[in-house]
């Protein structure tokens, strides 16, 4: 029950996070004009990853897209790439996690397969969240650098007479949406990975206890396997039913997935 809840919550948190990453990527307010001490401005500039906008105090807003690809700063291109990679990974992760949900029954899918899918989606969410956080942080760093550069030459004197006020930009709402969304996706991914461990629990390996009967030697082995006789009627330890238990060989093939989450 706790595993299902953890998995379900992880899915929902990641879903909200990815929706937030998509929203942040599409938002125009990645950087907004710094208003200094003046909260009311006649012309307000703000920029996104795809276009820049100007809102006038008349109520008119005009946005124009960045119709060049080569002319854009490399950092902006990198941020775009990180956000898109985050969205793509997140979307794939969501798709995978839907099929991995314990509450959803698809054919005769084994719990081990669901555990694998849960882990895969969890890792995808973690990487997606990290991509978003990295993208937003790179943009924020770019803003901080430009802010102090423009502050240094805030007023560039032209002939000592005319002043040209340089527009400074500060953090826009999209950055905060991106950070929060990235964090949520990351948390959702971690929850999925935790749920994966519960879906495929580690076996407690007890030593096989042999009981010597007068006629036959019967070894009882726990873990959902039928006892095998000493005469080799079930020497391969074939599964009689699937209750999420595995042979010792199977357990050994999984350590990296469960021990290094």
């Amino acid at each position: 029950m706790a595993v299902t809840a953890c998995q379900g919550l992880g899915f929902v948190v990641s879903l909200i996070g990815i929706a937030g990453i998509i929203a942040a990527t599409c938002m125009d307010q990645w950087s907004t004009q710094d208003l200094y001490n003046n909260p009311v401005t006649a012309v307000f500039n703000y920029q996104g990853l795809w276009r820049s906008c100007v809102r006038e105090s008349s109520g008119f807003t005009e946005c124009r897209g960045y119709f060049t690809l080569l002319g854009l700063p490399a950092m902006l291109q990198a941020v775009r790439a990180l956000m898109i990679v985050g969205i793509v990974l997140g979307a794939i992760g969501l798709l995978v996690s839907i099929f991995a949900l314990k509450c959803i029954r698809i054919g005769s899918m084994e719990d081990s397969a669901k555990a694998n899918m849960t882990l895969t989606s969890g890792i995808m969410f973690i990487v997606s969240g990290l991509c978003a956080i990295a993208g937003v942080s790179v943009f924020a760093n770019m803003l901080v650098t430009n802010f102090w550069m423009s502050t240094a030459n805030m007023y560039t004197g032209m002939g000592g007479m005319v002043q040209t006020v340089q527009t400074r930009y500060t953090f826009g709402a999209a950055l905060f949406v991106g950070w929060v969304a990235g964090g949520l996706t990351l948390i959702g991914g971690v929850m999925m990975c935790i749920a994966c461990r519960g879906l495929a629990p580690e076996e407690t390996n007890y030593k096989a206890v042999s009981y010597h009967a007068s006629g036959h030697s019967v070894a009882y082995k726990p873990g959902g396997f039928k006892a095998s006789t000493g005469f080799g009627s079930n020497t391969k330890n074939k599964k009689i039913y699937d209750g999420g238990a595995r042979t010792e060989d199977e357990v050994q093939s999984y350590p990296s997935k469960h021990d290094y989450v």
């Epitope: 004009q33 003046n38 009311v40 401005t41 006649a42 012309v43 500039n45 703000y46 920029q47 820049s52 906008c53 100007v54 006038e56 105090s57 008349s58 109520g59 008119f60 005009e62 124009r64 005319v162 002043q163 040209t164 006020v165 340089q166 527009t167």
Partner: antibody, heavy 115, light 113 residues
Framework: EVQLVESGGGLVQPGGSLRLSCAVS?????MNWVRQAPGKGLEWVAW????????TYADDFKGRFTISRDDSKNTLYLQMNSLRAEDTAVYYC???????????WGQGTLVTVSS | DIQMTQSPSSLSASVGDRVTITCKSS????????????LTWYQQKPGKAPKLLIY???TLRSGVPSRFSGSGSGTDYTLTISSLQPEDFATYYC?????????FGQGTKVEIK
């Protein structure tokens, strides 16, 4: 079609108060008051966002003048306190348009501050 | 505050003349966000309210005759009347529309020669 009609002007004594009104019809996102002293140039007084109520004033009028609006009556106001002789002017209300230009103006209302 | 200086303060011209009025601002009115200059031109006749002619330094308001044109960027702007008509004799004002407080030039009176 936008129509702006000012009212409330008249003779007032120095130190007195007056409230100007501007009846607005048509779409107005933000409005302004601009004045013109006799034989002088145009002087911007104040701006208001008709939806949010956000406002700003020219330095000479901060503290003395208050711009406001009444949504229900679709009316713009300019409350003028501590009036001085130099406040004598024709007061216009004007709509702010694209490019922060003033595209529609009222006919103006004359305010005379004299003892 | 941005100061607006118009020149000349008055001028005499004849019908059909080409008239140029200049306006200088103490700060650049060019907005980097949309590469537009926030300068506006108005015409005012005696006893009447001002009338909008040009916004964004060079965009003609609909209904305004094409003989009016605006140009300039940064701090220097020009209003040109290509062929003066009898109805054009009036006072012309430039306005800073870039930042509050909005400020007007002192005006240029165009009189009949």
């Amino acid at each position: 079609e936008v129509q702006l009609v000012e009212s409330g002007g008249g003779l007032v004594q120095p130190g007195g108060s007056l409230r100007l009104s501007c009846a607005v019809s048509g779409y107005t996102f933000s409005m302004n008051w601009v004045r013109q002293a006799p034989g002088k140039g145009l002087e911007w007084v104040a701006w208001i966002n008709m939806y949010t109520g956000e406002r700003t004033y020219a330095d000479d009028f901060k503290g003395r003048f208050t711009i406001s609006r009444d949504d229900s009556k679709n009316t713009l106001y300019l409350q003028m306190n501590s009036l001085r002789a130099e406040d004598t002017a024709v007061y216009y209300c004007a709509r702010l348009y694209r490019g922060n230009s003033l595209d529609y103006w009222g006919q103006g209302t004359l305010v005379t501050v004299s003892s | 505050d941005i100061q607006m200086t118009q020149s000349p303060s008055s001028l005499s011209a004849s019908v059909g003349d080409r008239v140029t009025i200049t306006c200088k601002s103490s700060q650049s009115l060019l907005n980097s966000g949309n590469i537009k200059s926030y300068l506006t031109w108005y015409q005012q006749k005696p006893g009447k309210a001002p009338k909008l002619l040009i916004y964004w330094a060079s965009t003609l308001r609909s209904g305004v005759p094409s003989r009016f044109s605006g140009s300039g960027s940064g701090t220097d702007y020009t209003l040109t009347i290509s062929s003066l008509q009898p109805e054009d004799f009036a006072t012309y004002y430039c306005q800073n529309a870039y930042s509050f407080p909005f400020t007007f030039g002192q005006g240029t009176k165009v009189e009949i020669k």
